[in-house]
Interface confidence: medium
Amino acid sequence: MKVLQEPTCVSDYMSISTCEWKMNGPTNCSTELRLLYQLVFLLSEAHTCIPENNGGAGCVCHLLMDDVVSADNYTLDLWAGQQLLWKGSFKPSEHVKPRAPGNLTVHTNVSDTLLLTWSNPYPPDNYLYNHLTYAVNIWSENDPADFRIYNVTYLEPSLRIAASTLKSGISYRARVRAWAQCYNTTWSEWSPSTKWHNSYREPFEQH
């Protein structure tokens, strides 16, 4: 049994880091493998992660972490029974993938303005709480070409757009994702999408 693709890990910078790797053949990850991880710090204890299958030869492990600070460094040991298959380390702050925003809501009752709001996925005491920026994706269910991205570079988790920038009388969907420049993170996954029917009063034409 050998590791074909070494584990790569990303952290949500809150409580979970996710590590993925590939074996050289079909593997029952949860019965055959264990990923041990230990914070390199005073009296920190080793923890064991039981991996799950992620495709035939792929494995994924969700490492639970009490808290994360930028200095944290973890040792990682991948075991198959008594055999050490791979040894490495992981610094969560250098591999951050933020949590996806939640509770995306479209408020359509604000005088021909669409107000999109969502929730910041982090609690206020987390470093990323005040460092997230967002991308909002809006698309038409009827017209695949009607697809747009709005970059929200301020901290408030909301976006206002004129309803008239979208077509009237058709249904749209929106979703939002986040990233943090301070840690050069990857983008989060998209939030679940939300749907609304776009309708607004056309202004009377003046002759």
Epitope: L39, F41, L42, L43, S44, E45, D66, D67, V69, S70, A71
Partner: antibody
Framework: DVKLVESGGGLVKLGGSLKLSCAAS????????MSWVRQTPEKRLELVAA????????YSPDTVKGRFTISRDNAKNTLYLQMSSLKSEDTALYYC????????????????WGAGTTVTVSS | DIQMTQSPASLSASVGETVTITCRAS??????LAWYQQKQGKSPQLLVY???TLADGVPSRFSGSGSGTQFSLKINTLQPEDFGSYYC?????????FGAGTKLELK
């Protein structure tokens, strides 16, 4: 009343051994990480040993590694420091200190200290 | 190892004055710093943790500030019971290290 009382200090010959004890009272001893901090005659403070709440994991810096062993007996609410191969630079006032329960894994500050016990290493 | 440089080594002041003690870390320790007070013949007492949070029962005339490599402890309107020695401690990496101390004496 939260209290830590050290004992076992004294005068010891170079290369000799000594065992310090710290009796804890007024709090749930078994919930806390504990440590020994020493203060030299020049008034410098140094962490010399630490132990987790169940005694399964210990730490000591390179200056005392292999010579000092920290242990605990949660049934007796007592912390110990076994010192061997003592050197003149080990002469100090030894404090038993409780690590605060607040914060995350890096929050290693000490919220309760004993009065200390003096160890003098003579040639 | 991270070195903690405390200044001044000693300081004379009068009751009612305001004094500031500083601690410099040899590398970034974020806010992982505590301040202790030690009176003559007594054990150290925790004053401030995480650079600026006052420990329980500590009077509000004490305040901690700073992050990264530069930290300070300020004592407003010195009281007779404030004289003694003050130490900083970083708890960011191992080994944890204390500053050499600042002795605050009555002028």
């Amino acid at each position: 009343d939260v209290k830590l009382v050290e004992s076992g200090g004294g005068l010891v010959k170079l290369g000799g051994s000594l065992k310090l004890s710290c009796a804890a009272s007024g709090f749930t001893f078994s919930s806390y990480y504990m440590s020994w901090v020493r203060q030299t005659p020049e008034k410098r403070l140094e962490l010399v040993a630490a132990i987790n709440s169940n005694g399964g994991s210990t730490y000591s810096p390179d200056t005392v590694k292999g010579r000092f062993t920290i242990s605990r007996d949660n049934a007796k609410n007592t912390l110990y420091l076994q010192m061997s191969s003592l050197k003149s630079e080990d002469t100090a006032l030894y404090y038993c200190a409780r690590r605060s329960l607040l914060g995350n894994h890096r929050d290693w500050y000490f919220d309760v200290w004993g009065a200390g016990t003096t160890v003098t290493v003579s040639s | 190892d991270i070195q903690m440089t405390q200044s001044p080594a000693s300081l004379s002041a009068s009751v009612g004055e305001t004094v500031t003690i500083t601690c410099r870390a040899s590398e970034n320790i974020y806010s992982y710093l505590a301040w202790y007070q030690q009176k003559q013949g007594k054990s150290p007492q925790l004053l401030v943790y995480n650079a600026k949070t006052l420990a329980d029962g500590v009077p509000s005339r004490f305040s901690g500030s700073g992050s990264g490599t530069q930290f300070s402890l300020k004592i407003n309107t010195l009281q007779p019971e404030d004289f003694g020695s003050y130490y900083c401690l970083h708890h960011y990496g191992t080994p944890l290290t204390f500053g050499a101390g600042t002795k605050l004496e009555l002028k």
